[in-house]
């Protein structure tokens, strides 16, 4: 009796089970009662990453430098090329088809996590006792100056955007 279902890594065609082509190879011809499935390796610029019956291999992704992309990992016959963004840029999506500049953290915010080629800068508000007076993609919130350790007193309180202003202690005569 002809099969109605096939084993893993097989497919049903013309009432018989044929072997799928292994990753890195494409289908040339289906199996017959006399021959196995005929497969051919993908060319240098192509890949197939699963057991398959595809008659065409997929083109490797192109990391377009005009979009700020660069190759992170060269593709093989079994894997696609992985793109990442040039320095100062990060991917706009998981598939990394284009890049945008990293955002800077505004004054009053510091960098919690520096951006990578695939993720943007993560900012956090400066908590009490810390400040940031610059717009930066690298700088964390800095602690207020400790006037006491300098034998000075606070003349002007700090904010999340400004440091405290220290001054000499008043000498009572």
């Amino acid at each position: 009796e002809p099969p109605t279902a096939c084993r893993e890594k097989q497919y049903l065609i013309n009432s018989q089970c044929c072997s799928l082509c292994q990753p890195g190879q494409k289908l040339v011809s289906d199996c017959t009662e006399f021959t196995e499935t005929e497969c051919l390796p993908c060319s240098e610029s192509e890949f197939l990453d699963t057991w398959n019956r595809e008659t065409r291999c997929h083109q490797h992704k192109y990391c377009d430098p005009n979009l700020g992309l660069q190759v992170q990992q060269k593709g093989t016959s079994e894997t696609d090329t992985i793109c990442t963004c040039e320095e100062g840029l990060h991917c706009t999506s998981e598939s990394c088809e284009s890049c945008v500049p990293h955002r800077s953290c505004l004054p009053g915010f510091g960098v919690k996590q520096i951006a990578t080629g695939v993720s943007d800068t993560i900012c956090e508000p400066c908590p009490v006792g810390f400040f940031s007076n610059v717009s930066s993609a690298f700088e964390k919130c800095r602690p207020w100056t400790s006037c006491e350790t300098k034998d000075l007193v606070v003349q002007q309180a700090g904010t999340n955007k400004t440091d405290v202003v220290c001054g000499p202690q008043d000498r009572q005569r």
């Epitope: 040339v28 011809s29 199996c31 017959t32 009662e33 006399f34 021959t35 196995e36 005929e38």
Partner: antibody, heavy 117, light 107 residues
Framework: EVKLVESGGGLVKPGASLKLSCAAS????????MSWVRQNSDKRLEWVAS????????YYPDNVKGRCTISRENAKNTLYLEMSSLKTEDTALYYC??????????WGQGTSVTVST | DIVLTQSPATLSVIPGNSVSLSCRAS??????LHWYQQKSHESPRLLIN???QSISGIPSRFSGSGSGTDFTLTINSVETEDFGIYFC?????????FGGGTKLELK
Amino acid sequence: EVKLVESGGGLVKPGASLKLSCAASGFTFSNYGMSWVRQNSDKRLEWVASISSGGDDTYYPDNVKGRCTISRENAKNTLYLEMSSLKTEDTALYYCTRAGGKAMDYWGQGTSVTVST
Amino acid sequence: DIVLTQSPATLSVIPGNSVSLSCRASQSIRDNLHWYQQKSHESPRLLINYASQSISGIPSRFSGSGSGTDFTLTINSVETEDFGIYFCQQFNSWPLTFGGGTKLELK
């Protein structure tokens, strides 16, 4: 018991035609692909033709394409090989074989074809 | 066409000894290879399919190995009934092709 019995061989002149038959028994003939394989005096084996179980698909090597026709009559459990424009190099023992698991799992005893002037 | 080259052409052996027969393909055929045995005045019979899978009714002293382009048929402790010609056959692609055979004879 699987049995394949070839017949129809003989001595013919170059350019002549011949039709070989293979009577199959001991299995469901219509469920199996069948092939013809020949063996020359040097004992070399050469695939000649194959036909799918239903008879819809036929396969030939280039050196016999157009000169050989494989066919089957499932109702009669019989396989055929019609050969025309015979050449001296077609001289061989012709075997009928059954295709099981993509192998030639059963062979007949062969029928001899001699092409000579 | 895929060419199968068998070596040696002839192999002389003493019963009880073990032998290895080689079959080399002109390009990769994965494991799509069968082995056949033909005794004197008999038809060929299937010994091994898919390069290494044993066939029901065939003595366990026969085993096959290999993949890609290099294949081996091993006969452990040859018996007198094993003398004859051994053929490999590829079924990776059309046309189906056979090796030239290795004749196993008594030393």
